[in-house]
């Protein structure tokens, strides 16, 4: 058993049929010695008396809020949560496996630049009695500070018969050094509590590996005289690191119709303009990627050919 | 060329060669993103590698103030990786595929380090650690880790030279 926060404790249980469970001793936080009784949740049934209560925790019915009283007055609470371990593996029932970029990916994180700011998100089908707490650091043995905000519900989607909820959190490295080569990864730890179930999820990454620039901005077209060609120009996204002579992007420019199966024109460039062939009912799209490190491409920025 | 005395390097040449190094480092190990090598005790095996750190003056302001600190650090790293790529970690079993770009990568590391430090001038270089794994599978894992680390190192070097070529060239 360990303390998650004040008056909230996590009991780690090997979860299998007829498991013996864990013996837990609860102590009432009071100077009083006599006349103390214990109850669980809303029940008025007295579970025991005395300053300590010894219980055998085997299942979710044994978890919950234990309260010690004296003469009708509440003295203190202890909330017991269960963390299940099945076949040596901690349960991951609360969050959905996003399976990208690999199986058992519960947390996904992205950064728009090298400033040390990043966003992580996760998915669940659970709608109520759900809380998250996020901690982060740079490195684990001698951790350096990363500050995370509160996790918030950022999107709701309908997936077949189920509703899916996306939560996200923003974090900022306290002393970020955008130009340095990272040697220790960022660690992100998410505590998830659903009713009386506790789970924790972790992710470890370098900012450079989760970079995904915003799409290029201000796409403009200029038809070339006596030609089918069009000069397309754009600018670096506002959120990208500066100066651009140091933090450079490379771009992919594509002309394509509405269907992915249609023919296309495509060219890669390090410049912020390119000449392409525009077709009726097609769109010109541009996306960006770090020029020197192959992290994710941005989403496309598009303008119609006409 | 970046001479210890403090003259300027051939920024544009260094830019071109460092960008080539980036391309080669990714072709040598393109599936980097699909392997989470940090789970394999990454900190013990590659923490001896010279990283370009915050105080090394490789940020735009540091380069403007005095690029020599940064260039020395980059040179140190290039020599270090050049030695690693020539060591039995890469020459031993399992043999590299004949079309592996590691050979080109090795030659380009040497080429850039020579651009930075001509014959007869010597910056101190970092001692190469004795990473000599006994098992072929350990060697394979170490190769991946070294190439992954090299990708990060050459990316920073390429940014330095691109910025230098754009803003510090005579």
């Amino acid at each position: 058993i360990w303390e998650l926060k004040k008056d909230v404790y996590v009991v780690e249980l090997d979860w299998y049929p007829d498991a013996p469970g864990e013996m837990v001793v609860l102590t009432c936080d009071t100077p009083e010695e006599d006349g103390i009784t214990w109850t669980l949740d809303q029940s008025s049934e007295v579970l025991g008396s005395g300053k300590t209560l010894t219980i055998q925790v085997k299942e979710f019915g044994d978890a919950g809020q234990y309260t010690c009283h004296k003469g009708g007055e509440v003295l203190s609470h202890s909330l017991l949560l269960l963390h299940k371990k099945e076949d040596g593996i901690w349960s991951t029932d609360i969050l959905k496996d996003q399976k990208e970029p690999k199986n058992k990916t519960f947390l996904r994180c992205e950064a728009k630049n090298y400033s040390g700011r990043f966003t992580c998100w996760w998915l669940t089908t659970i709608s109520t009695d759900l809380t998250f707490s996020v901690k982060s650091s740079r490195g684990s043995s001698d951790p350096q500070g990363v500050t995370c905000g509160a996790a918030t519900l950022s999107a709701e989607r309908v997936r077949g018969d189920n509703k899916e909820y996306e939560y996200s959190v923003e974090c900022q490295e306290d002393s970020a050094c955008p130009a340095a080569e990272e040697s220790l990864p960022i660690e992100v730890m998410v505590d998830a509590v659903h009713k009386l179930k506790y789970e924790n999820y972790t992710s470890s990454f370098f900012i450079r590996d989760i970079i995904k620039p915003d799409p290029p901005k201000n796409l403009q077209l200029k038809p070339l005289k006596n030609s089918r060609q069009v000069e397309v120009s754009w600018e670096y996204p506002d959120t990208w690191s500066t100066p651009h002579s140091y933090f450079s992007l490379t771009f992919c420019v594509q002309v394509q119709g509405k269907s992915k199966r249609e023919k296309k024109d495509r060219v890669f460039t390090d410049k912020t303009s390119a000449t392409v062939i525009c077709r009726k009912n097609a769109s010109i799209s541009v996306r960006a990627q770090d020029r020197y490190y192959s992290s994710s491409w941005s989403e496309w920025a598009s303008v119609p050919c006409s | 060329r970046a001479v210890p005395g403090g003259s300027s390097p051939a920024w544009t040449q260094c830019q071109q060669l460092s960008q080539k190094l980036c391309t080669l480092a990714w072709s040598a190990h393109p599936l980097v993103g699909h392997m989470d090598l940090r789970e394999e005790g990454d900190e013990e095996t590659t923490n001896d590698v010279p990283h370009i750190q915050c105080g090394d003056g490789c940020d735009p302001q540091g380069l403007r103030d005095n690029s020599q600190f940064c260039l020395q650090r980059i040179h140190q790293g290039l020599i270090f990786y050049e030695k690693l790529l020539g060591s039995d970690i890469f020459t031993g079993e399992p043999s590299l595929l004949p079309d592996s770009p590691v050979g080109q990568l090795h030659a380009s590391l040497l080429g850039l380090s020579q651009l930075l430090q001509p014959e007869g001038h010597h910056w101190e270089t970092q001692q190469i650690p004795s990473l000599s794994p006994s098992q072929p599978w350990q060697r394979l894992l170490l190769r991946f880790k070294i190439l992954r680390s090299l990708q990060a190192f050459v990316a920073v070097a390429a940014r330095v030279f691109a910025h230098g070529a754009a803003t510090l060239s005579p």
Epitope: Q229, R261, K263, D265, R266, V267, F268 | -
Partner: antibody, heavy 118, light 107 residues
Framework: QVQLVQSGAEVKKPGASVKVSCKAS????????LHWVRQAPGQGLEWMGW????????EHAPKFQGRVTMTTDTSTSTAYMELRSLRSDDTAVYYC???????????WGQGTMVTVSS | EIVMTQSPATLSVSPGERATLSCRAS??????LHWYQQKPGQAPRLLIY???QSISGIPARFSGSGSGTEFTLTISSLQSEDFAVYYC?????????FGGGTKVEIK
């Protein structure tokens, strides 16, 4: 499968014109760009231009501007390349090539030998 | 127009050996570079597109690398059917241009 079949060899006099055909099969004709590339005997490849069979748009290499006409007949899935004012240095194998991507060549015809000789 | 230069013009290699072919552009072309193989009396065949992207059906011994102005086609272990002429082609800007070719012959 995607296939391009070209017309047979031609012998022409200097100053004459030649029209080479390229019949496509195995795909929807308007779904691919069509290019013409030539190769003089013992020489390398030279791009001449492209046509979009969907709308008839064309773009030629400056070298052939005014001397080449590229057309298509969607009813027969056939592309044509006419080269006028032939000179002896136009002697070459003329290839049609196609791709969904505009700027490189995925599928090639077998080539048509055009000899220009007086 | 962009001039593409291939070297060497002829490469003599023994079967089973590795062949490295070079292609240089007269200006930076990012990764807008494609490789073709041509055997005598046949049309060219696309091997690699956008500098390093492999084509399904092309043996894995063919690989491409490079960006900017310098590109390489590597044939890891030459088979008898690989003796041919290889061309690079830039697609950075029109007119599209080819290199002069590298003939890979049996040593």
């Amino acid at each position: 499968q995607v296939q391009l079949v070209q017309s047979g060899a031609e012998v022409k006099k200097p100053g004459a014109s030649v029209k080479v055909s390229c019949k496509a099969s195995g795909y929807t004709f308007t779904d691919y760009y069509l290019h013409w590339v030539r190769q003089a005997p013992g020489q390398g490849l030279e791009w001449m231009g492209w046509i979009d069979p969907e709308n008839g748009d064309t773009e030629h290499a400056p070298k052939f501007q005014g001397r080449v006409t590229m057309t298509t007949d969607t009813s027969t899935s056939t592309a044509y390349m006419e080269l006028r004012s032939l000179r002896s240095d136009d002697t070459a194998v003329y290839y049609c090539a196609a791709n969904k991507e505009l700027r490189y060549f995925d599928v090639w015809g077998q080539g048509t030998m055009v000899t220009v000789s007086s | 127009e962009i001039v593409m230069t291939q070297s060497p013009a002829t490469l003599s290699v023994s079967p089973g050996e590795r062949a490295t072919l070079s292609c240089r552009a007269s200006q930076s072309i990012s990764i807008n570079l494609h490789w073709y193989q041509q055997k005598p009396g046949q049309a060219p065949r696309l091997l690699i597109y956008f500098a390093s992207q492999s084509i399904s059906g092309i043996p894995a011994r063919f690989s491409g690398s490079g960006s900017g102005t310098e590109f390489t086609l590597t044939i890891s272990s030459l088979q008898s059917e690989d003796f041919a002429v290889y061309y690079c082609q830039q697609s950075n800007s029109f007119p599209l241009t080819f290199g002069g070719g590298t003939k890979v012959e049996i040593k």
